[in-house]
């Protein structure tokens, strides 16, 4: 099908566009280009007749068009009015008409934009600023960049006027950034120079540093004040309400106890007209004080909270030391010390982090220790444990179940039978039980501090008759000489004897057989293929006995060294060679053959008809067991003699 492709589709004014023809028929009378979506002689641009090789300009020809032999049309020095559709009309040599329409769009090259602003010095939390991207251009898209990133999503940022205007409501200091606007159309993109927004703010509440408020007599006091402010703040110092000096720093050498008091820093911004003050209380000690530990969380929750222990007071030029459980701090990624060692942070506390914790202040002569602090870590409850572990009881006995779950504070317990609440105690006691007491016994442990609850369910069966037991195994397909297997007789029942049989016989004495867990568990170490037998367990008490169904142990073994049969190694020429390979293995192995090292077939039997001396060589059988991951092989030499050359040779199969 005849098609027109515009290259490019979007054309810049002054540039050129090629209307490229695809699938032009081979035998042509001629072709003609028209402006618009149909053949219209009044809008013909140019035509070409093959026979005369003559191009004829039409009424719509502008002198900027060039027609090519392949019918493609080049339009140069594009103007806005060239936008639109163009139709190619092709007359084939059999005078059959065909036409196709293409189109392109013309856009101007954009000028470099600039940003105008309605407020050059807005005040934080008070003013709005409107940036406008100049000039206004038709068919252009406007984009904005903040610090060379696209606009963040914010309710304080609003685009309007076709995205030409960016308004920042209630400006903040964080709006102090480089702003650029960009104009785009399909043929060009231009960015403005950046405009830096200068937001007036502050002063914020000043910060006095250093933070320590305790000093020793004889030290120098050097306080610095800083408040975030634009333009930068002017500072004043007051001691106990009395003005001292208009500087950012306050220096008092060789302080004494008399220098204790309230120190006020005042910050003033002359443009915003705002003042802010901060007061710090300085204490000058004659001797270093006894340290003490403060905690940011007195009841942290295990695996959730972090705890920051801080050694007080803060004293300049002092070494802080820490001990846990009367030992120096262990190396742990969960223990972090601040730069000055004053704060010890325990990340994601556990129940083992209770302590005690001590901190110390080292002076020239000694180390002063704080009193020990113990952390009260809230944890649990863990999954409750119901004891005893029996699940079968005889009628008439007393049922006494106890529940315990690790928890801080200690858990509150509830018992449910078959989903019905019974009592809020840690122990459940039912005397003289009957079959009706069989059911699901649920213990629920609740930690009131963490709000967490955990439950454990136990099935209790009250029956004079013991149930038919069953055998569970920890390994259904053990590998010979490698794996151990543990059989457990289920269920666990009170006052019950457990017995075992192998192939209907009582257990043989073997160092590889071991009974444990009140004879309930039978462990076979280093299983062998001879252990692939029927195992039965039995339970009995004073009134009944029962045996399980047999469980046959499926031991994976092999492959053993294979055997090639027949054993003959000498054959007469012309005989059939029929070699069979066998290896003891569970599961059955995969077989493959190699003759003189060259792989042959993956079969158990190798058959070669009418052998000749060319069949002399080494015949190797390879066996592999995918289940055990083991391999084995054997090599046999075969000699083939020419017929009648040597007596006693096998005639083959």
């Amino acid at each position: 099908k005849l098609t027109i492709e515009s290259t490019p589709f979007n054309v810049a004014e002054g540039k050129e566009v090629l209307l490229l023809v695809h699938n032009l028929p081979q035998h042509l009378f001629g072709y003609s280009w028209y402006k618009g979506e149909r053949v219209d002689g009044n809008r013909q641009i140019i035509g070409y007749v093959i026979g005369t090789q003559q191009a004829t300009p039409g009424p719509a020809y502008s002198g900027r068009e060039i027609i090519y032999p392949n019918a493609s049309l080049l339009i140069q020095n594009i103007i806005q009015n060239d936008t639109g559709f163009y139709t190619l009309h092709v007359i084939k040599s059999d005078l059959v008409n065909e036409e196709a329409t293409g189109q392109f769009r013309v856009y101007p090259e954009l000028p470099k934009p600039s940003i105008s602003s309605n407020n050059s010095k807005p005040v934080e939390d008070k003013d709005a600023v409107a940036f406008t991207c100049e000039p206004e251009t038709q068919d252009a898209t406007y984009l904005w960049w903040v610090n060379n990133q696209s606009l963040p999503v914010s309710p304080r940022l609003q685009l309007s006027n076709g995205n030409r205007t960016l308004t920042l409501f209630n400006v903040t200091r964080n709006d102090t950034a480089s702003y650029k606007c960009e104009t785009q159309n399909p043929v060009s993109a231009r960015r403005s120079d950046s405009v830096i927004l200068n937001v007036l703010y502050g002063p914020d509440a000043p910060t006095i540093s250093p933070l320590n408020t305790s000093y020793r007599s004889g030290e120098n006091l050097n306080l610095s004040c800083h408040a975030a402010s634009n333009p930068p703040a002017q500072y004043s110092w007051f001691v106990n309400g009395t003005f001292q000096q208009s500087t950012q720093e306050l220096f008092i050498p060789n302080i004494t106890v008399n220098n204790s008091g309230s120190y006020t820093c005042q910050a003033h911004n002359s443009d915003t007209g705002l003042n802010r003050t901060t007061v710090t209380t300085i204490t000058v000690y004659a001797e270093p004080p006894k340290p003490f530990i403060t905690s940011n969380n007195s009841n942290p929750v295990e695996d959730e909270d972090a705890v920051a222990l801080t050694c007080e007071p803060e004293i300049q030029n002092t070494t802080y030391l820490w001990w846990v459980n009367n030992q120096s701090l262990p190396v742990s990624p969960r223990l972090q010390l601040s730069n000055d060692n004053r704060t010890l942070t325990l990340l994601s506390v556990t129940r083992n982090d209770v302590g005690p914790y001590e901190c110390g202040i080292q002076n020239e002569l000694s180390v002063d220790h704080s009193d020990p602090v113990i952390l009260n870590v809230l944890y649990g409850p863990d999954d409750p444990t119901i004891s005893p572990s029996y699940t079968y009881y005889r009628p008439g006995v007393n049922l006494s179940l106890s529940c315990h779950a690790a928890s801080n504070p200690p858990a509150q317990y509830s018992w449910l039978i078959d989903g019905n609440i019974q009592q809020h105690t840690q122990e459940l006691f039912i005397s003289n039980i009957t079959e009706k007491n069989s059911g699901l016994y649920t213990c629920q442990a609740n930690n009131s501090a963490s709000g967490h609850s955990r439950t454990t369910v136990k099935t209790i069966t009250v029956s004079a008759e013991l149930p038919k037991p069953s055998i569970s195994s920890n390994n259904s397909k053990p590998v010979e000489d490698k794996d151990a297997v543990a059989f457990t007789c289920e269920p666990e029942a009170q006052n019950t004897t457990y017995l075992w049989w192998v192939n209907g016989q009582s257990l043989p004495v073997s160092p590889r057989l071991q009974l444990s867990n009140g004879n309930r568990t039978l462990t076979l170490f280093n299983v062998t293929r001879n252990d692939a037998r029927a195992y039965v367990c039995g339970i009995q008490n004073s009134v009944s006995a029962n045996r399980s169904d047999p469980v046959t142990l499926d031991v994976l073994y092999g492959p053993d060294t294979p055997i090639i049969s027949p054993p003959d190694s000498s054959y007469l020429s012309g005989a059939n060679l029929n070699l069979s390979c066998h290896s003891a293995s569970n599961p059955s192995p995969q077989y493959s053959w190699r003759i003189n090292g060259i792989p042959q077939q993956h079969t158990q039997v190798l058959f070669i008809a009418k052998i000749t001396p060319n069949n002399n060589g080494t015949y190797a059988c390879f066996v592999s067991n995918l289940a055990t991951g083991r391999n084995n092989s054997i090599v046999k030499s075969i000699t083939v003699s020419a017929s009648g050359t040597s007596p006693g040779l096998s005639a083959g199969a």
Partner: antibody
């Protein structure tokens, strides 16, 4: 001046044959597409056949396909229409016409004066 | 094949009248339509090609319009020499003619 002169018309029996000629002058015949159009007595115009400048491309109306053959001899500036198996309904004035060598949908810009073909027993 | 239907088949008018003849194609033929004038005993004469292009030497009172399936030949002010039969022809394949419209003096 462009001139097209048809000849070869006349009376012929049904089933008979006739060969029409069109002598061309006043233009470059060898590069022009040509055609035949007929007009039955008292009826409208009916396009019959067209031929390309080099005889490679020919086309026919369904009513004459297989019976009429269009051809040309560029060395003699002559267009031909060989008419076989003539029928009574082929009776008409046969016009020779030229397609102009312009890249517009096909049209006839010059016509001959016509030659009458009568098919009757 | 594409059928061409002219209407009216005949029409009476006076000198100076504005006359319109229409031609309808049985399917779209883009702008591939020509108009011819034929006087009795004479060969046809090309008036309009490609639906709206006036053939060189044809008076400007003749004009053509339309595209797709509906086309019109208009004579803006009828002259004595314009009384004749007018044929439309589609320039597709085959080059079918309309049945003709006879323009007579009223």
């Amino acid at each position: 001046e462009v001139q097209l002169l048809e000849s070869g018309g006349g009376l012929v029996q049904p089933g008979g044959s006739l060969r029409l000629s069109c002598a061309a002058s006043g233009f470059t015949f060898s590069s022009s597409y040509m055609g035949w159009v007929r007009q039955a007595p008292g009826k409208g115009l009916e396009w019959v056949s067209s031929i390309g400048s080099g005889s490679y491309s020919t086309s026919y109306a369904d009513s004459v396909k297989g019976r009429f053959t269009i051809s040309r001899d560029n060395s003699k500036n002559t267009l031909y229409l060989q008419m076989n198996s003539l029928r009574a309904e082929d009776t008409a004035v046969y016009y020779c016409a030229r397609y102009p060598s312009v890249p517009f949908p096909p049209h006839f810009d010059y016509w001959g004066q016509g030659t009458l073909v009568t098919v009757s027993s | 094949d594409i059928q061409m239907t002219q209407s009216p088949s005949s029409l009476s008018a006076s000198v100076g009248d504005r006359v319109t003849i229409t031609c309808r194609a049985s399917q779209s033929i883009s702008s591939y339509l020509n108009w011819y004038q034929q006087k009795p005993g004479k060969a046809p004469k090309l008036l309009i090609y490609a639906a709206s292009s006036l053939q060189s030497g044809v008076p400007s009172r003749f004009s053509g319009s339309g595209s797709g399936t509906d086309f019109t030949l208009t004579i803006s002010s009828l002259q004595p020499e314009d009384f004749a039969t007018y044929y439309c022809q589609q320039a597709g394949n085959p080059h079918t003619f309309g049945q003709g419209t006879k323009l007579e003096i009223k």
